[in-house]
Every structure is written in structure tokens, then in C-alpha cells.
């Protein structure tokens, strides 16, 4: 049997289909690029992004990037292909339905990033340790 997500050629174009011929629809993500943010010292924040976009490619997931430096705080919301690095980092949590922020090392700023794959999941960004996915029970909940 043909596994799901097999690439099939239709009119010489590679489109993502399952073995019954249905076409995979891209993710719906908040997509405001970089905006100034008031999100600081909170367990979670809403993006305050009013634009929900259909991602360009079916394999893309939702991404949020929170950055704080001496001058300002910004929140970036986009779609991105998890096979490709974003801001030089791999999107390791792309299969999660929730956008759980993880700190990344960037000189001169505090930098958090999350990725996820459910509708508009980068609208609610979560910093709280309660959601730390090193907890195996939570991993079961997230990936069920």
C-alpha cells in the first residue's frame, strides 16, 4: 500500500497527496512578519496579529519568534518549512499543536522561538515551564 503524503505527479507538477488522491491543504498561520510587542514576563501571550494566512506550501508550519534587546521587544509570526532552518535554528517542535517557546542563544538579545502545526497556533505563544515538553506524559498528550 502507498503510505500517506506520497508525492504524485499531476500535470508534471509535484503536489502532496494521500493514497486516495486528496490534496493536502496548507497550514493556517498568523502572519504579520515582525511587529513591536508588549509581551514580557508572562507565561503566555497572544500575538495581536490580525492576519491569518494560508501558508504558501503544504509542508510549512506556523512559527513565532520573540526577541528582546536594550531598545525593544518584537514578535514575528510567519509560515516556514521545517526542513529549512529559520534564523539559523532548526524547527525541532514543528509537529506540536501548541507554540511552546524555547530560548535560543543569540548575542546581544534574548531570543525565543516556537513552531507548531495546528490552525493559528502561533497566535498563542507559551513561555511557561509547565508546558516543557521534556515531560514524557505531556509529549503523549501533544502528539496523540
Amino acid at each position: 500500500t502507498i503510505p500517506p503524503h506520497v508525492q504524485k505527479s499531476v500535470n508534471n507538477d509535484m503536489i502532496v497527496t494521500d493514497n486516495n488522491g486528496a490534496v493536502k491543504f496548507p497550514q493556517l498561520c498568523k502572519f504579520c512578519d515582525v511587529r513591536f510587542s508588549t509581551c514580557d514576563n508572562q507565561k503566555s501571550c497572544m500575538s495581536n496579529c490580525s492576519i491569518t494566512s494560508i501558508c504558501e506550501k503544504p509542508q510549512e508550519v506556523c512559527v513565532a519568534v520573540w526577541r528582546k534587546n536594550d531598545e525593544n521587544i518584537t514578535l514575528e509570526t510567519v509560515c516556514h518549512d521545517p526542513k529549512l532552518p529559520y534564523h539559523d535554528f532548526i524547527l525541532e517542535d514543528a509537529a506540536s499543536p501548541k507554540c511552546i517557546m524555547k530560548e535560543k542563544k543569540k548575542p546581544g538579545e534574548t531570543f525565543f522561538m516556537c513552531s507548531c502545526s495546528s490552525d493559528e497556533c502561533n497566535d498563542n505563544i507559551i513561555f511557561s515551564e509547565e508546558y516543557n515538553t521534556s515531560n514524557p506524559d505531556l509529549l503523549l498528550v501533544i502528539f496523540q
Epitope: G21, A22, V23, K24, F25, P97
Partner: nanobody
């Protein structure tokens, strides 16, 4: 048998408008999300717009936001795409598509599209 019949395409000048229609049959139209996709010459399939089953929620690709409007008339089993401020890069065959299942939430959306689509050519 599910049938989706697109119409309304044609030749239009840049900056012009067109309204595409999709007549649906063979399924309970008001239970399903519907979408429009397009395939430009030599390019891949691009999803341009999505509408919820009840028509209250609409979504767009960045490439068409602010210019295209998706709508539906559940009493007529018809899906529409109003296209304004058309550009040369909007030239494509446009396809109406139906979600494979009626469920919502954190499930991967899969869509079926059939028929020949309707050709939109934007040229002066």
C-alpha cells in the same frame, strides 16, 4: 457522485475584475469547508482562499489578500471568488475544491478538486 463545476473565467485587462462561480452537487454542501486553488502555467498548485462551512470564516494567501473575496451561498450550493485589481501573475486555471471530511480542529485538511477548472487570463 461529487461534482464541482467552475465558471466565470475569461480574458481581462490588468486592474480588472472577474467573479468565478463553482456549482457543487453530490454532497451536503453546507457541511463542508470549500476552497479555491489555482495553477499558473508551468507552476505548482497554489491555494488562494478557504471558507468555513457556514461561511463565517474566510482565509487568504498573502498573494491575493485584499484583492480577492471568497463567499458561498449554501441555499444555492454555490461557491464564489470575486477577484479585483487583477494582475498578470493571477493568470492561471482556477479550481474549486471540497474538503475530504467534514471534521474541524487539529486534523490535516485534505481537499478534492475535479473538473477542468476555469481559465483566467490577465493581459493587456
Amino acid at each position: 457522485e461529487v461534482q464541482l463545476l467552475e465558471s466565470g473565467g475569461g480574458l481581462v485587462q490588468p486592474g480588472g475584475s472577474l467573479r468565478l462561480s463553482c456549482a457543487a452537487s453530490g454532497f451536503t454542501f453546507f457541511n463542508y469547508e470549500m476552497a479555491w486553488a489555482r495553477r499558473a502555467p508551468g507552476k505548482g498548485l497554489e491555494w488562494v482562499s478557504l471558507i468555513s462551512a457556514d461561511g463565517t470564516r474566510t482565509y487568504y494567501a498573502n498573494s491575493v489578500r485584499g484583492r480577492f473575496t471568497i463567499s458561498r451561498d449554501n441555499s444555492k450550493n454555490t461557491l464564489y471568488l470575486q477577484m479585483n485589481s487583477l494582475r498578470a501573475e493571477d493568470t492561471a486555471v482556477y479550481y474549486c475544491a471540497k474538503r475530504r471530511d467534514a471534521s474541524m480542529g487539529h486534523t490535516t485538511r485534505r481537499f478534492d478538486y475535479s473538473g477542468q477548472g476555469t481559465l483566467v487570463t490577465v493581459s493587456s
